[in-house]
């Protein structure tokens, strides 16, 4: 029998290789019973992970799951770094696992690098 | 049930590449990680590297970088493996495993396939 | 890479008797989750792996709880309270904390 707590379905270690000045949209997956739970985003700053208010969010509905979206419009470098959601549930907090966003400033590039050369850059790979 | 059917064995030459699949039911596809581990006959296993399907997000085994290519597709949820340069060493079972939500944690496994590289 | 070693490589126990198969790291495997994702699996002859026990000591479902998991940093340790005959096999284990993931060399378990 499937549980009915809440749980929030961000993938462990996973990463999003972004350009500034595009659209993007983060999705946290969360799958609920009953109630659809109060969702947040927040940015890691550290071991802290700070609220983000006032920005774009949405909810987008699937078969079995639904979707908390944080919209970059459009992304900034800054936006560069680790988030995770986390939703409010009988009293108690659920915290998804991080992602992360390297944000590439096109800018400072030549010409936008490919998905290969971003995924081979070490600090990438071992972050 | 979570089902992860795997392509027939494969008989290969040195220096040749070859492209093993793996199709997934049973689960959503895009919110899981496609992992490849590998074992040689009579030899432990391997851990190759991870495809995130949903983005095509790819994280190796440093010592299959530029070998190894991991591919998913959505439409047909099936995950792929091309191993390129082959040498006898690549002969080995490769299995390929999924894990709930991307969790990580290798909950899946495929029946493997046996790649054969001989001259 | 992390190093995960294994002992003993093989044991034969009687059927009945306990068994118990120690995994050591290179470096702690507590990832800043706060979660140590260290798993044992299993592998009987001429079968796919399957997993035992994720996280050091939660039991997979239909995994009998004469298999236990125990252990914290870099210690850890797979424990049968009483082998049975299909216990044969093969079992590892294996880190997903760091990048590359690794496996343990493998433990063979043979019956007396």
């Known amino acids: 029998k499937e549980s009915c707590d809440v749980q929030l379905y961000i993938k462990r270690q996973s990463y999003h290789s972004i350009f500034a000045g595009d659209p993007f949209k983060l999705e946290c997956p969360v799958k609920y019973c009953a109630h659809r739970p109060q969702v947040t985003w927040c940015k890691l700053n550290g071991t802290t992970c700070v609220k983000l208010e006032g920005r774009h969010t949405s909810w987008k509905q699937e078969k079995n799951l639904s979707f908390f979206i944080l919209h970059f419009e459009p992304v900034l470098p800054s936006d560069n770094g680790s988030y995770r959601c986390s939703a409010n549930f009988l009293s108690a907090i659920i915290e998804s696992h991080s992602t992360t966003l390297y944000v590439t400033d096109v800018k400072s590039a030549s010409e936008r690098p490919s998905k290969d050369e971003m995924a081979s850059r070490p600090w990438l790979l071992y972050s | 049930q979570v089902q992860l059917v795997q392509s027939g064995a494969e008989v290969k030459k040195p220096g040749a590449s070859v492209k093993l699949s793996c199709k997934a039911s049973?689960?959503?596809?895009?919110?899981?990680?496609a992992h490849w581990v590998r074992q040689a006959p009579g030899q432990g296993l391997e851990w190759i590297g991870r495809i995130d399907p949903a983005n095509g997000n790819t994280k190796y085994d440093p010592k299959f970088q530029g070998r190894a290519t991991m591919t998913a597709d959505t439409a047909s949820n099936t995950a792929y493996l091309e191993l390129s340069s082959l040498r006898s060493e690549d002969t080995a079972v490769y299995y390929c495993?999924?894990?709930?939500?991307?969790?990580?944690?290798?909950?899946?496994w495929g029946q493997g396939t046996l790649v054969t590289v001989s001259s | 890479d992390i190093v995960m070693t294994q002992t003993p490589l093989s044991l034969s126990v009687t059927p009945g008797q306990p068994a118990s198969i120690s995994c050591k790291s290179s470096?702690?495997?507590?990832?800043?989750?706060?979660?140590?994702?260290l798993n044992w699996f299993q592998q009987r002859p001429g079968q796919s792996p399957r997993r035992l026990i994720y996280l050091v000591s939660k039991l997979d479902s239909g995994v009998p709880d004469r298999f236990s998991g125990s252990g914290s940093g870099t210690d850890f340790t797979l424990k049968i309270s009483r082998v049975e005959a299909e216990d044969v096999g093969v079992y590892y284990c294996?880190?997903?904390?760091?990048?590359?993931?690794?496996f343990g060399q493998g433990t063979k378990l043979e019956i007396k």
């Open positions: 495993v999924a894990d709930h939500y991307g969790s990580s944690l290798l909950d899946y």
């Open positions: 470096q702690s495997l507590l990832d800043s989750d706060g979660k140590t994702y």
């Open positions: 294996w880190q997903g904390t760091y990048f590359p993931y690794t």
């Open positions: 049973g689960y959503n596809f895009k919110h899981t990680y």
